[in-house]
């Protein structure tokens, strides 16, 4: 690849559009670039209404390799023609483009969560943002996975209304004095690869019975 020319093939960049905490985040990585850009500018237009490319204000001359497009990309039906420009000082190093269709290209990152273990149950507190744009609701199911001693159980809590505010789910009928691990993720359709959260684990405290059994020994 000649670095004088800014017209790299689109394979120079790898893009990913993710729903992170119900925000549309476009991130990118550069492939085989020996000159690292000092900054980037992101531009886009809508395919059904092609106009001049519009600069994304909060992603103009940015040093970050991601851009929050929640307030720009409001439709899951439209295709957004996206151009990423990479600069070193005043020199344009490259330009990559790609079309995004949120309904099919979006990946869904797991929400933040906390767990608290009790004798025979675990409280799972899932943190959703207080307000979620209607356009970014998608058709998502929350899945909570419980793992213990090699056995995995899936819980699909029914969430009334949309996924906003904090949500608590109780995994009950658990065995005291046992280690349990929990992972959460958002499922869009059966066919889409899911991104599971890292496991959070807790050793449940011993119950009354096991305590009396221990003292009897």
């Amino acid at each position: 690849i000649s670095y004088d020319s800014p017209d790299y093939t689109d394979e120079s960049c790898t893009f990913k559009i993710s729903l992170r905490n119900f925000r549309s985040i476009l991130s990118w990585e550069l492939k085989n670039h020996s000159i690292v850009p000092t900054h980037y500018t992101l531009l886009y237009t809508i395919m059904s209404k092609p106009e001049d490319l519009k600069v994304v204000k909060n992603c103009a001359n940015t040093t970050r390799s991601f851009c929050d497009l929640t307030d720009e990309w409001r439709s899951t039906h439209e295709a957004y023609v996206t151009v990423l420009e990479g600069f070193s000082g005043n020199t344009t190093l490259f330009s990559c483009s790609h079309n995004f269709w949120l309904a099919i290209d979006m990946s869904f990152e797991p929400p933040e969560f906390e767990i608290v273990g009790f004798t025979n149950h675990i409280n799972v507190m899932v943190k959703f943002p207080s307000i979620v744009e209607e356009e970014l609701q998608f058709d998502l199911s929350l899945v909570i996975e419980e793992q213990s001693e090699g056995i995995v159980k899936k819980h699909k809590p029914e969430i009334k209304g949309n996924m906003s505010g904090n949500f608590t789910y109780i995994i009950d009928k658990l065995i005291p004095n046992t280690n349990y691990c929990v992972s959460v993720y958002l499922e869009h359709s059966d066919e889409q690869a899911v991104i599971k959260s890292p496991l959070k684990c807790t050793l449940l405290p011993p119950g009354q019975e096991s305590e009396s059994a221990e003292s009897a020994k």
Partner: antibody, heavy 117, light 112 residues
């Protein structure tokens, strides 16, 4: 110019599987999703599903889950659809079509699948 | 699933005369983004489908302006101001708002 070139007609026995292909040319293949649509005499046009050629994400019509499997090979700009456990009811013309968003703007020429013993 | 109902099933028209096809959806195709995701296509005999109209009324490039699309919400119409011989075939409406995408049953335009 934009072209979606589909594989040739298939005559297959009941119970077997068939894999049909759709090769895109004249545009950046990974900028457009590929959809599959079935046309049979009984059912007019039926949308089978869509695959994101860049992300690999798929969305199937529930009716075709377990029947159709969509895949994509970016290196050859080709999308594939495998149809499993074929019966006479699967005899139809299968079209691929591309979309960037909500509308199918170019269609392949169709692949005829005939299931007969 | 969204049901798309087209009428009539068959339309016999004299060349030079107007034609009109109706399409009704069981759910609104108007999205929160303000757009309505209703499309029309034509399948000429022995050919693959070809898109004519998208977003209710936008004509595809190369489509003559004798074709017009109109409607909103759940009721849509495709009109041909003066039918020509090349217009014969089967017309389908389809929606791209709700998965699974669904098609109307088709309207066959015949030349009298």
């Amino acid at each position: 110019q934009v072209q979606l070139q589909q594989s040739g007609p298939e005559l297959v026995r009941p119970g077997v599987s068939v894999k049909i292909s759709c090769k895109g040319s004249g545009y950046t293949f990974t900028d457009y999703a590929i959809h599959w649509v079935r046309q049979s005499h009984a059912q007019s046009l039926e949308w089978i599903g869509v695959i994101g050629t860049y992300s690999g994400n798929r969305n199937y019509n529930q009716k075709f889950k377990g029947k159709a499997t969509m895949t994509v090979d970016k290196s050859s700009s080709t999308a594939y659809m495998e149809l499993a456990r074929l019966t006479s009811e699967d005899s139809a013309i299968y079209y691929c079509a591309r979309s960037a968003g909500y509308s199918l703007d170019f269609w392949g020429q169709g692949t005829s699948v005939t299931v007969s013993s | 699933d969204v049901v798309m109902t087209q009428t009539p099933l068959t339309l016999s028209v004299t060349i030079g005369q107007p034609a009109s096809i109706s399409c009704k959806s069981s759910q609104s195709l108007l999205d929160s983004d303000g757009k309505t995701y209703l499309n029309w296509l034509l399948q000429r005999p022995g050919q693959s489908p070809k898109r004519l109209i998208y977003l209710v009324s936008k004509l595809d490039s190369g489509v003559p302006d004798r074709f017009t699309g109109s409607g909103s919400g759940t009721d849509f119409t495709l009109k041909i101001s003066r039918v020509e011989a090349e217009d014969l075939g089967v017309y389908y409406c389809w929606q791209g708002k709700h998965f699974p995408w669904t098609f109307g049953g088709g309207t066959k335009l015949e030349i009298k």
